[in-house]
């Protein structure tokens, strides 16, 4: 950055190099150039010369004042006009930053995605700070009282191998940056209660010719959790409102769920599961599309990872892949 240049003087910021966004700040420049009594001192922000709010304090020093500074980052440098020098002489430079102290982290959540071998902890960091903000995740065993700390800049994956203090833990998050520090409430967890089953996937759909045609959705999960509760939501693509069906399953077999749908309409389906009676759900699966036939012939549809349609007479259903905001359930 600009802070690496060789200086012939000194530049400093009041109240500080990192300050709260919207503050009034002063940038001072003091020249110390051999055989130069500066005729004029100039300030540059991001390479552009500033023309206003500059005050000469004494022979070697000037001040640039900003009201309500709102830029997250800026590179400042100052120069001097020296007699007998054709070009301006660089005095010094500094990178400055503005932002906010961290909010109190809330909604601390820790889950173990099945087959990941990790406990993943996330939280709501609150408003954007604009400046480098670090988070320390504290994990304290309720059985051994031993505490471990993990430094991160966002979420954290903690290997279950490092959780040697039994199954009950307290987890909390400290947020800190140059402008402040905050700490979340403590979350109490039991490792057996936070496992999210391996992602449920809709694989294909079939509309069967009957007096009332019915659509069968085939879906599955690699989970080895014995008691799993799932929700499947579906709607016509033209609708805003989802219909939701609930299921209890152990995924011994591929699941087959029946729906009585309107003919000649494109529907979208998603599924998600949780270990029965536990708190955390998988994210919704990728979108799966199925168009019901106009009349009675049997239609089999398959899932495709990309948005490609089958040609020919069969109606294609597609799974468009990662359209959900969070597909971490897709492990294993």
């Amino acid at each position: 950055g600009i802070t690496n240049i060789n200086c012939s003087g000194h530049i400093w910021v009041e109240p500080a190099t990192i300050f709260k966004m919207g503050m009034n700040i002063s940038i001072y420049c003091q020249a110390a150039i051999k055989n130069c009594q500066p005729r004029k001192l100039h300030f540059y922000k991001n390479g552009i010369k500033e023309r206003f709010q500059i005050t000469r304090i004494n022979k070697t020093t000037a001040r640039l004042w900003y009201k309500n500074f709102l830029e997250p980052h800026a590179s400042m440098y100052c120069t001097a006009e020296c007699p007998k020098h054709f070009q301006e002489t660089l005095i010094c430079g500094k990178d400055i930053s503005s932002g906010y102290p961290p909010d109190i982290p809330d909604e601390v959540t820790c889950v173990i995605y099945e087959y990941s071998g990790n406990m993943t902890c996330t939280w709501n960091a609150g408003k954007l700070t604009y400046i480098d903000t670090k988070y320390v995740v504290h994990v304290k065993s309720l059985e051994t009282e031993e505490e471990q700390q993990y430094l991160t800049s966002s979420y954290i994956n903690i290997s279950t191998d490092s959780l040697q203090g039994g199954k009950k833990y307290l987890v909390w998050v400290q947020a800190a940056n140059a402008l402040g520090m905050e700490e979340s409430k403590q979350l109490q967890i039991h490792l057996d209660d936070i496992v999210i089953p391996s992602a449920a996937v809709i694989s294909r759909a079939e509309t069967i010719n009957a007096t009332v045609p019915k659509t069968i959705i085939y879906w599955d999960s690699q989970t080895t959790i014995e008691k799993v509760s799932c929700e499947m939501r579906y709607k016509a693509t033209t609708n805003q409102t989802w219909n939701v069906k609930e299921f209890d399953t152990n995924f011994t077999y591929v699941q087959q769920s029946e729906f009585y749908l309107e003919p000649n309409i494109k529907y979208v389906f998603q599924v998600r599961c949780q270990e029965t009676g536990k708190r955390y759900w998988q994210p919704w699966s990728s979108l799966f599309f199925h168009k019901t036939p106009e009349t009675v012939p049997q239609v089999t549809s398959k899932a495709f990872q990309h948005d490609t349609w089958n040609s020919g007479l069969t109606v294609a259903s597609i799974s468009t892949g990662h359209l959900t905001s969070d597909n971490r359930g897709d492990i294993g």
């Epitope: 087959y115 990941s116 071998g117 990790n118 290997s159 279950t160 191998d161 996937v201 694989s203 294909r204 085939y218 599955d220 690699q222 080895t224 995924f251 591929v254 990728s286 398959k302 899932a303 495709f304 990872q305 799974s319 897709d330 492990i331 294993g332």
Partner: antibody, heavy 117, light 107 residues
Amino acid sequence: QIQLVQSGPELVKPGASVKMSCKTSGYTFTDYYINWVKQRPGQGLEWIGWIYPAINNTNYNEKFKGKATLTVDTSSRTAYMQLNSLTSEDSAVYFCAISRKPYFDYWGQGTTLTVSS
Amino acid sequence: DIQMTQSSSSFSVSLGDRVTITCKASEDLYNRLAWYQQKPGNAPRLLISGATSLGTGVLSRFSGSGSGKDYTLSITSLQTEDVATYYCQQYWSIPWTFGAGTKLELK
């Protein structure tokens, strides 16, 4: 009944590529994950990765990323594994195995790969 | 990756013996463990999943036990057809990993 029939033995030169197959029958092809497992002579088993034909999804052991490529042809119910930039370390028996869970219920008979100049 | 250690690479056994094969994981597997039997020139065969659940068609003289990091495969009365190599496999964490195998050899 469920059957997995793998292609025959391969003798290839170092640096070359090979594509072996695993033809399946006796079950709904899209219902099972197809895994590939490596066994070097007199040694243990190493999981290479799986492919899920229902959505053409793959998951590789990090160690085999760039070495193995898994594909399927749903119409012929066949899974393929291509191995590239072969060295003597790749000489092994390669098994395909199907599963709905992360353990392997049904296995092919294995394909012997010999890499030699 | 999780390391799976089968402490004995081979075992000398007699017909009718009760045989115990052990497998130790580098971390807690929460019972996500399978056992396989492999005979020379053949593919492995699933014996047990979930540390204790017998696979389809597996005879009741085979049983699995254990929890945490330590698991055991037991054969109550060894028969000729049980002479083979036995592998454990973890599925707590991808990549799935196997033990190096324990070979049973007749005395």
